[in-house]
């Protein structure tokens, strides 16, 4: 059985956080000054 938690965001488990970074495919690598 799955447990529910009281998180700081007070969100229920029915609303999933993907946990994923943006990882945009169009990001370009640029050396910092």
């Amino acid at each position: 059985s799955e447990t529910t938690t009281g998180t700081s965001s007070n969100s229920s488990q029915s609303t999933s956080n993907s946990g994923l970074a943006p990882n945009p495919t169009n990001a370009t690598t640029k050396a910092a000054g």
């Epitope: 999933s16 956080n17 993907s18 945009p24």
Partner: antibody, heavy 117, light 113 residues
Framework: QVQLQESGPGLVKPSQTLSLTCTVT?????????WSWIRQPPGKGLEWIGY???????RYNPSLKSRVTISRDTSKNQFSLKLSSVTAADTAVYYC??????????WGQGTTVTVSS | DIQMTQSPSSLSASVGDRVTITCRSS????????????LTWYQQKPGKAPKLLIS???TRASGVPSRFSGSGSGTDFTLTISSLQPEDFATYYC?????????FGGGTKLEIK
């Protein structure tokens, strides 16, 4: 309260496979977030190893990809790390952590793994 | 991979001092879709796991004292501790949570002067 706890052998021989498990309490690993492994060699910085998402999909650090497998046991609310062909360079404290869309918000306490014959 | 460079690598300071740690990324961490910077700060004490301090460059995590603040955008970021407390002596890491593989800075060790 979300808690993560690493477990596994503290000593692994060179060329063997390192196997660790992270047990999660207070949240179901199938309900959301990514569940990552991160390591820290003695006296050094942090290195992200990879994750298994709540969907079951995985992503690994290319620097380790050929040696890493992350899997899960949903019945036990656990996820695991296997790192093959280890060398002394794999000696580190290994952490499991929960990944949000912006950070690692919950971490295990870490487990030390030494690679030595 | 995005390279994260922190400076200084170590810093000696006294209780009550104002301290600033800098972090530079080799690529902009500003996501055009939501205008957020995906830069995170952690605090680590010896023998302990890192603790989340700040996400999105400037958003303090729950329970983090207001003396900790983050700023910056694009490639240049800072973590400021306005008035050092004894419990703040630790190592601080920045991390980019923007593009995989996720990467961390080398750390800044904050020591008592």
């Amino acid at each position: 309260q979300v808690q993560l706890q690493e477990s596994g052998p503290g000593l692994v021989k060179p060329s063997q496979t390192l196997s660790l498990t992270c047990t999660v309490t207070g949240y179901s690993i199938t309900s959301g977030y990514t569940w990552s492994w991160i390591r820290q060699p003695p006296g050094k910085g942090l290195e992200w190893i990879g994750y298994i998402q709540y969907t079951g999909s995985t992503r690994y650090n290319p620097s380790l990809k050929s040696r890493v497998t992350i899997s899960r046991d949903t019945s036990k609310n656990q996820f695991s790390l296997k790192l093959s062909s280890v060398t002394a360079a794999d000696t580190a404290v290994y952490y499991c952590a929960r990944g949000t869309t912006a950070s690692f918000d919950y971490w295990g306490q870490g487990t030390t793994v030494t690679v030595s014959s | 991979d995005i390279q994260m460079t922190q400076s200084p690598s170590s810093l000696s300071a006294s209780v009550g001092d104002r301290v600033t740690i800098t972090c530079r990324s080799s690529q902009s961490l500003l996501y055009s879709s939501d205008q957020k910077n995906y830069l995170t700060w952690y605090q680590q004490k010896p023998g302990k796991a890192p603790k989340l301090l700040i996400s999105w460059a400037s958003t303090r995590a729950s329970g983090v004292p207001s003396r900790f603040s983050g700023s910056g955008s694009g490639t240049d970021f800072t973590l400021t501790i306005s008035s050092l407390q004894p419990e703040d002596f630790a190592t601080y890491y920045c991390q980019q949570y923007f593009i995989y593989p996720l990467t961390f800075g080398g750390g800044t060790k904050l020591e008592i002067k």
